[in-house]
């Protein structure tokens, strides 16, 4: 059994997370991963997942009752979504960071606009795409 | 010429963007999107980056002078990250609009860590994956 | 000041054990990963093992897999390596090395490394 | 396993600059942190450059790391050279589940 299971039990005690009303309405991240099976699209959504998490464990970083589960969980997700890399996790953690409300981001956001959208798709690196007829307004 | 080009110069207009100065001190995403070139760890990093931009854009959504340009860029951009796919967007949106602070949804988020965590890993849908021995401490 | 000492190296036969032990001082020892990096005479860096701060997590060169097992006594600042099952290519110093992120970081580098204890297997 | 390739060796006057490569054979080389080693005869390695490119504090500034996508190798670069830079350097760099050195490269300065 990974560390993570027993530090998770003990983070659902503490957040009073593991009576059954808790699934009531629906489940915030479980039904979506579902809908998602190649892992680009999963990856994806994961990542709006684990930052979710991050901003979590950041403001319960002061409760010294789960400090040890907390890190046990964070050590174990470092391992199982940036694969150990903390390169991967420094760079994901940077644009974590970034301030939207911040006039010199947002400048420098507006700057490299147009080649972070050439990125974007991953046809991208290989040749020109066709554009998708499909109708998306907003 | 996608049509996002266009639009984006005239952000760079709005937003006083195009200057050299703004390059000062680095880039914002550039640098990032240039260490990963495996599609699943550029999604990692797309995906913060649309945020941040789907962010950025809504804090100017009453903007007149700048709604199409702004439109046009969010349509090329679900475009091509999103591939078109509604439902794609609509999950990312739900998962970019959880408030970390809300504690109904604190409560579902470690109800369903344990689940969310099994899945992190590429190899979690194929069989039981070795754990990695490389060294994280949380 | 950090400073990190190995000692337990020596002269030994081919198929023998030896353990090394490397203590620490001038930093909160269990917050740092640690490594072993051993250099065989005139030869280049070899990375041998690692271990996280909690000791939770390990791992290996492919080299002395299944032969070697690192450990650390946390309560003691002590960085262990067992060595068993000795060949001579394993002769080489044995440095002792701390990580220079804090934390749950990755090893992704050492900043303080110890002077070093040789270590010879020969019959 | 991939491999961190390094010159064997390289020679440079005092006061002159000297730049010394190390290409990684398989994957990207941005994808990991790269770190640099000084080693003088006699001595354990010390840190120069670490995370592609940050000093240690004591390190002078004549010391920089940079890393190179397009040629899948970092650099160290030392300018104003000086005798007591005449060392072996390494380049380090890992996967998920490796830590590799490369093989080292000598800095002979005239």
């Known amino acids: 059994q990974d560390p993570y299971v027993k530090e998770a039990e003990n983070l659902k005690k503490y957040f009073n997370a593991g009576h059954s009303d808790v699934a009531d309405n629906g489940t915030l991240f479980l039904g979506i991963l579902k809908n998602w099976k190649e892992e680009s699209d999963r990856k994806i959504m994961q990542s709006q997942i684990v930052s979710f998490y991050f901003k979590l464990f950041k403001n319960f970083k002061d409760d010294q009752s789960i400090q040890k589960s907390v890190e046990t969980i964070k050590e174990d997700m470092n391992v199982k979504f940036f694969n150990s890399n903390k390169k991967k996790r420094d760079d994901f953690e940077k644009l974590t960071n970034y301030s939207v409300t911040d006039l010199n981001v947002q400048r420098k956001a507006i700057h490299e606009l147009i080649q972070v959208m050439a990125e974007l798709s991953p046809a991208a690196k290989t040749g020109k795409r066709k554009r998708s007829q499909m109708l998306f307004r907003g | 010429q996608d049509p996002y080009v266009k639009e984006a110069e005239n952000l760079k207009k709005y937003f006083n963007a195009g200057h050299s100065d703004v390059a000062d001190n680095g880039t914002l995403f550039l640098g990032i999107l240039k260490n990963w070139k495996e599609e699943s760890d550029r999604k990692i990093m797309q995906s913060q980056i649309v945020s941040f931009y789907f962010k950025l854009f809504k804090n100017f959504k009453d903007d007149q002078s700048i709604q199409k340009s702004v439109e046009t860029i969010k349509e090329d951009m679900n475009v091509k990250f999103f591939n078109s796919n509604k439902k794609k967007r609509d999950d990312f949106e739900k998962l970019t609009n959880y408030s970390v602070t809300d504690l109904n949804v604190q409560r579902k988020a470690i109800h369903e860590l344990i689940q969310v965590m099994a899945e992190l890993s590429p190899a979690a849908k194929t069989g039981k994956r070795k754990r990695s021995q490389m060294l994280f401490r949380g | 000041e950090v400073q990190l000492l190995e000692s337990g190296g020596g002269l030994v036969q081919p198929g023998g054990s030896l353990r090394l032990s490397c203590a620490a001082s001038?930093?909160?020892?269990?917050?740092?990963?640690m490594s072993w990096v051993r250099q065989a005479p005139g030869k280049g860096l070899e990375w041998v093992s690692a271990?996280?701060?909690?000791?939770?997590?390990?791992y290996y060169a492919d080299s002395v897999k299944g032969r070697f097992t690192i450990s650390r006594d946390n309560s003691k600042n002590t960085l262990y390596l067992q060595m068993n099952s000795l060949r001579a290519e394993d002769t080489a110093v044995y440095y002792c090395a701390k990580d220079h992120s804090s934390g749950w970081y990755v090893i992704s580098g050492m900043d303080v490394w110890g002077r070093g204890t040789m270590v010879t297997v020969s019959s | 396993n991939f491999m961190l390739t390094q010159p064997h060796s390289v020679s440079e006057s005092p006061g002159k600059t000297v730049t010394i490569s190390c290409t990684r054979s398989?994957?990207?080389?941005?994808?990991?942190?790269v770190q640099w080693y000084q080693q003088r005869p006699g001595s354990s390695p010390t840190t120069v450059i670490s995370?592609?490119?940050?000093?240690p504090s004591g390190v002078p500034d004549r010391f920089s790391g940079s890393v190179d996508s397009s040629s899948n190798s970092a650099s160290l670069t030392i300018s104003g050279l000086r005798t007591e830079d005449e060392a072996d350097y390494y380049c380090q760099s890992n996967d998920s589940d490796n830590v590799v050195f490369g093989g080292g490269t000598k800095l002979t300065v005239l």
């Open positions: 001038g930093f909160t020892f269990s917050s740092y990963a």
């Open positions: 995370e592609d490119n940050q000093r």
């Open positions: 271990i996280s701060g909690s000791g939770g997590s390990t």
């Open positions: 398989s994957g990207s080389i941005a994808s990991n942190y």
